[in-house]
């Protein structure tokens, strides 16, 4: 049920993209594909071309992103356009100047003098972005999120992009000036993972970091199973990052044990942050039996 | 820190039984909570665990009549169904180690135990 | 088949000697393993926990190592006070959980 056709419009498209790039991502690094017919990754693959083909018809003059060309570009739709496009650009053809086009835009337009994100032209379809729905500490979570999308097009983009590092570097320090003031286990998760992405996650903000975590194995708000699986898997990865093996399995294990596998309404983010996160634990950890995770996907009926 | 378990007594089969932990010294809304029995002159056997959230992870074979409950901030319960003559034991409680999970940081400390007699 | 074989069931040394204490588990449970004493009467303790971490107030003498699929608990300089029946504890999944049968430790 991973595996979809894209379709809709700028932000719908990239709901149906999603699910696709990071099934095709985590089976890939898993080297699971032998289970499912490896016949059915290059299917998966054009799928992934059509929603990027599709996207495009959203990219506008500035090179953002919005749900319909005649509405302001997001911030937080085109960030998450980079961070889409920077994972498929490992699977098909993705135009640098597209997306390096994002990356600049996000830079040039929308970083404020202290670092910050702003968003003024937010989604419609709210229910795509995860844990930063809930506006409590949003220019900490914004910034973290667009931190995180410029580190992962870092590589595809530096070369193009001057400002590049100077802008990670000035969102980096906003949100170290922030991080021992945040409440929300969501926002100290994914700025944990964006200063871990810097090698910055160190004391005090390493203790915050850990300390946010209930029992030591989550990061949790009180009934939000879709915030919480996104934010642990967040934190998984920067504790991967900082190679803490010692914390990662019981981390590890509730996100197995929550038995959640993508897919379902509200569940964009969710979707792509576990999958990216146990990808990268199999990837850092070779002697992974104790993830015993029983996914299964399917290409839509043609 | 220290937890008393309570409820233990002779039963009949089939009687249900409500045995609870009691803690000191902490607080559970920040604390894993253990259960593990021990059979007279046997080893230990474990049964299930309760996150500081309330969710439960059960042995297998405990599952169904087996159910850990947090009741309020210093106590926990496991209420236990359709008794027989082999669910005589001593039943002891634990904390997760560090407030951790139980299974990987370990349980510490315990409780003294409470007898529970299922006799016709 | 259970989640751990722990041998032997039980073993004797001389004060000062040194103890060994193992158990396989059934399949990977990397570091979810921990070990416990119990003496008579009295509920377990934990020594070990992450299959090799000195749990506190523990004493040096005592030592978690893991090889594979095999876990040892090691007392080097035993004393007397470490008369008692230990435990380990292995985790495959939380409903695929078990202690080992138990090893009795008698000090000569």
């Known amino acids: 049920h991973l595996i979809v056709t894209p379709a809709g419009a700028g932000e719908q498209n990239m709901i149906g993209m999603t699910p696709t790039v990071i099934a095709v991502h985590y089976l890939d690094q898993t080297e699971q594909w032998e289970k499912f017919g490896i016949e059915k990754r290059q299917e998966a693959l054009e799928l992934i071309k059509k929603g990027y083909t599709q996207q495009l018809a959203f990219k506008q003059p500035s090179s953002a992103y919005a749900a319909f060309n005649n509405r302001p570009p997001s911030t937080w739709l085109t960030a998450y356009v980079v961070k889409v496009f920077s994972l498929a650009a490992n699977l098909i053809a993705i135009d640098s100047h597209v997306l390096c086009g994002a990356v600049k835009w996000l830079i040039l337009e929308k970083q404020k003098p202290d670092g910050v994100f702003q968003e003024d032209g937010p989604v419609i379809h709210q229910e795509m972005i995860g844990g930063f729905r809930n506006a409590k500490e949003a220019d900490v979570s914004l910034t973290a999120f667009v931190l995180i999308a410029l580190q992962e097009a870092r590589d595809i983009c530096e070369g193009q992009v001057n400002s590049l590092p100077g802008s990670i570097n000035k969102a980096g320090e906003y949100i170290e000036a922030s991080y021992m003031n945040l409440q929300r286990p969501y926002t100290v998760a994914i700025a944990g993972y964006a200063l871990a992405l810097m090698n910055k996650l160190e004391e005090p903000y390493l203790g915050k970091f850990l300390n946010t975590a209930k029992d030591r194995n989550r990061w949790e708000e009180p009934d939000q199973q879709l915030y919480n699986v996104e934010a642990t898997s967040y934190a998984l990865l920067a504790l991967l990052l900082l190679k803490d093996f010692d914390s990662v399995p019981p981390v590890v294990r509730w996100l197995n044990e929550q038995r959640y596998y993508g897919g379902g309404y509200g569940s964009t983010q969710a979707t792509f942050m576990v999958f990216q996160a146990l990808a990268q634990y199999q990837t850092d950890v070779p002697d992974h039996k104790d993830l015993n995770m029983d996914v299964s996907f399917h290409l839509p009926s043609r | 820190q220290s937890l008393e378990e309570s409820g233990g007594r002779l039963v009949t089969p089939g009687t249900p039984l409500t045995l609870t932990c009691t803690v000191s010294?902490?607080?559970?809304?920040?604390?894993?909570m253990a259960w593990v029995r021990q059979a007279p002159g046997k080893g230990l056997e474990y049964i299930g665990w309760?996150?500081?959230?309330?969710?439960t992870y059960y042995a297998s074979w405990a599952k169904g009549r087996f159910t850990i409950s947090k009741t309020s901030s210093t106590t926990v319960d496991l209420k236990m169904t359709s008794l027989t003559t082999e669910d005589t034991a001593t039943y002891f409680c634990a904390s997760g180690n560090d407030g951790g999970d139980p299974l990987y940081y370990g349980m510490d400390p315990w409780g003294p135990g409470t007898l529970v007699t299922v006799s016709s | 088949d259970g989640v751990m074989t722990q041998t032997p069931s039980s073993t004797s040394a001389a004060v000062g000697g040194t103890v060994t204490i193992k158990c396989q588990a059934s399949?990977?449970?990397?570091?979810?393993l921990s070990w416990y004493q119990q003496k008579p009467g009295q509920p377990p303790k934990l020594l070990i926990y992450e299959a090799s971490k000195l749990a506190s107030g523990v004493p040096s003498r005592f030592k978690g190592s893991r090889s594979g699929t095999e876990y040892t608990l090691a007392i080097s300089g035993v004393q007397r006070e470490d008369a008692a029946t230990y435990y380990c504890l292995g985790s495959i999944a939380s409903d695929d959980t078990a202690f080992g049968a138990g090893t009795n430790v008698e000090i000569k």
């Open positions: 010294g902490f607080s559970l809304s920040r604390y894993t």
């Open positions: 399949q990977s449970i990397r570091s979810w």
């Open positions: 309760i996150d500081s959230s309330g969710s």
